[in-house]
Interface confidence: low
């Protein structure tokens, strides 16, 4: 038998070997595909199957527009002019080349020694599903489940039957200062079909370190406020994108939604204490600000009560 690959939507002509080029012809086409429950014999006279597959005057079989359901086996049995029976056997596979794959949600930079999501490679509209592969500096990246982790997802469109592939790459770069180039390629796995490549992304790898310049600003300055007054604490961080900010009072997290600003209206003595903010940045982990003391007092003459500006309470996860 002969293996044939046909592009979805395009016509396919299968020749019936040995058949005379014009009538009278003794031939029979049989097919077993996704359209048939078992073997279906086609009549040269035509019929309801003509829109799907019909026999041409020269004995060849025409599929005007191949679809996924046309995958299967096609057989022709013909008697040539000398009365000898000749058989043809075809195994038909169809394919569809997807659009060019893309890397969506790419990282802006990577941090050495911690897991970083590089991005998600997406290919839409393939058949068969095919495969996505990641490349680092032009070389194939083999996932090892440790420094290189790939999460794959394949979905099939319920109507068209075409596949969408997603591949999420997470890496732990070993050292900073490098500029690795990542790309992704889609391959159908068919002969003579070249892989489709994404545009490469080049990312800077930096050494792990806390977000620079985390400061806790307090209003009123000095942190001394009269009962019933308002205190505004602002966690000022220069990191981009802005990290999530949680608030700590006397060493315990406050049960509040993350926010860079903490407003304490109508303060009472129960609001007194040491406050700090903790910034959680995806590539660094938490970093705590220097603490600030809040004092509630009738008189404003006790002097500044700011917490000492020491080291951050949290280092980075290297």
């Amino acid at each position: 038998g002969q293996n044939i690959t046909a592009r979805i939507g395009e016509p396919l002509v299968l020749s019936c070997k040995g058949a005379p080029k014009k009538p009278p012809q003794q031939l029979e086409w049989k097919l077993n595909t996704g359209r048939t429950e078992a073997w279906k014999v086609l009549s040269p006279q035509g019929g309801p199957w003509d829109s799907v597959a019909r026999i041409l005057p020269n004995g060849s079989l025409l599929l005007p527009a191949t679809g996924i359901v046309d995958e299967g086996t096609f057989r022709c049995r013909a008697t040539n002019r000398r009365g000898k029976e000749v058989k043809s056997n075809y195994r038909v596979r169809v394919y569809q080349i997807p659009g060019k794959p893309e890397i969506v949600d790419p990282a802006s930079e990577l941090t050495a020694s911690v897991p970083n999501k590089v991005g998600t490679c997406v290919s839409e509209g393939s058949y068969p599903a095919g495969t996505l592969s990641w490349h680092l500096d032009g070389k194939l990246l083999i996932p090892d489940g440790k420094e290189t982790l790939v999460k794959e997802e394949t979905r099939r469109h319920p109507e068209t039957g075409l596949f969408t592939l997603r591949s999420e790459l997470t890496v732990i770069p070993t050292q900073g200062g490098t500029h690795p180039t990542f790309s992704c390629s889609f391959s159908l796995g068919l002969p003579r079909r070249r892989p489709l490549n994404t545009a490469p992304i080049q990312l800077r790898v930096r050494e792990p370190g806390p977000p620079e310049g985390i400061q806790l600003l307090v209003e009123p300055e000095g942190g001394i406020v009269a009962p019933g007054g308002t205190v505004t604490l602002t966690c000022a961080i220069s990191a981009q994108p802005p990290p999530q900010v949680h608030w700590i009072k006397d060493g315990a997290p406050l049960p509040l939604a993350p926010s860079p600003v903490l407003l304490l209206p109508e303060v009472g003595h129960e609001d007194e204490g040491t406050y700090s903010c903790v910034a959680t940045h995806p590539s660094h982990g938490p970093q705590e600000s220097p603490p600030v003391s809040i004092r509630v007092t009738e008189t404003g003459d006790e002097g500044p009560a700011e917490g000492s500006v020491g080291e951050s309470g949290l280092g980075t996860l290297a």
């Epitope: 897991p115 489940g145 440790k146 982790l149 999460k151 959680t280 982990g285 280092g315 996860l317």
Partner: antibody, heavy 117, light 109 residues
Framework: EIQLQQTGPELVKPGASVKISCKAS????????MLWVKQSHGKSLEWIGN????????FYNLKFKGKATLTVDKSSSTAYMQLNSLTSEDSAVYYC??????????WGAGTTVTVSS | QAVVTQESALTTSPGETVTLTCRSS?????????ANWVQEKPDHLFTGLIG???NRSPGVPARFSGSLIGDKAALTITGAQTEDEAIYFC?????????FGGGTKLTVL
């Protein structure tokens, strides 16, 4: 064989400090972070913090900040955890575990710390 | 702080398949939580089984597998054996804070 060997049980008085060690063997000590975990009697596990032996950088659960101090000695492939100002709440089994972020595959046998006067 | 919830106890029979789950109070567990599964045998013997949601630790039998099922992390033991009787803890990373579940006591009868 990869092993994490922890010090034996410790009986300490309230207010005192204790330093637990975790000696690594069978792998490159600086290639993995070391995780420390607390298991109180009849309770679940609590993450204390991590240390990256390569950088010496630490990363603490806020709950244990000030209570635990993590250090390493690269020359002896040993990780240490010092617990300060001990109270009965600190009586527990403390574990070190090797981690590479994806998993914590090898654990020490644990060090039992009992705080009692 | 997030709370991680597990079944307190499960019972299975040798050869059966059993699935332990791990729920997060903050919403769906995702691959970004790098779900870990740790086994505790008597005498405080801990072994890491699964990390990064579905990566088996070196030397762990293939009958142990990790996955996400719905909005939870899951540990499946396919063809449980009597030696699998243990307490299983899951742990989830939250922006580099690690939180353990309460543990599931698995009995293999």
């Amino acid at each position: 064989e990869i092993q994490l060997q922890q010090t034996g049980p410790e009986l300490v008085k309230p207010g005192a400090s204790v330093k637990i060690s975790c000696k690594a063997s069978g792998y490159s000590f600086t290639d993995y972070i070391m995780l420390w975990v607390k298991q109180s009697h009849g309770k679940s596990l609590e993450w204390i913090g991590n240390i990256n032996p390569y950088y010496g950088s630490t990363f603490y659960n806020l709950k244990f900040k000030g209570k635990a101090t993590l250090t390493v000695d690269k020359s002896s492939s040993t990780a240490y955890m010092q617990l300060n100002s001990l109270t009965s709440e600190d009586s527990a089994v403390y574990y070190c575990a090797r981690s590479d972020y994806w998993y914590f595959d090898v654990w020490g046998a644990g060090t039992t710390v009992t705080v009692s006067s | 702080q997030a709370v991680v919830t597990q079944e307190s106890a499960l019972t299975t029979s040798p050869g059966e398949t059993v699935t332990l789950t791990c729920r997060s109070s903050t919403g769906a567990v995702t691959t970004s939580n790098y779900a870990n599964w740790v086994q505790e045998k008597p005498d405080h013997l801990f072994t890491g089984l699964i990390g990064g949601t579905n990566n088996r630790s070196p030397g762990v039998p293939a009958r142990f597998s990790g996955s996400l099922i719905g909005d939870k992390a899951a540990l499946t033991i396919t063809g449980a054996q009597t030696e699998d009787e243990a307490i299983y803890f899951c742990a989830l990373w939250y922006s580099n804070h690690l939180v353990f579940g309460g543990g599931t006591k698995l009995t293999v009868l």
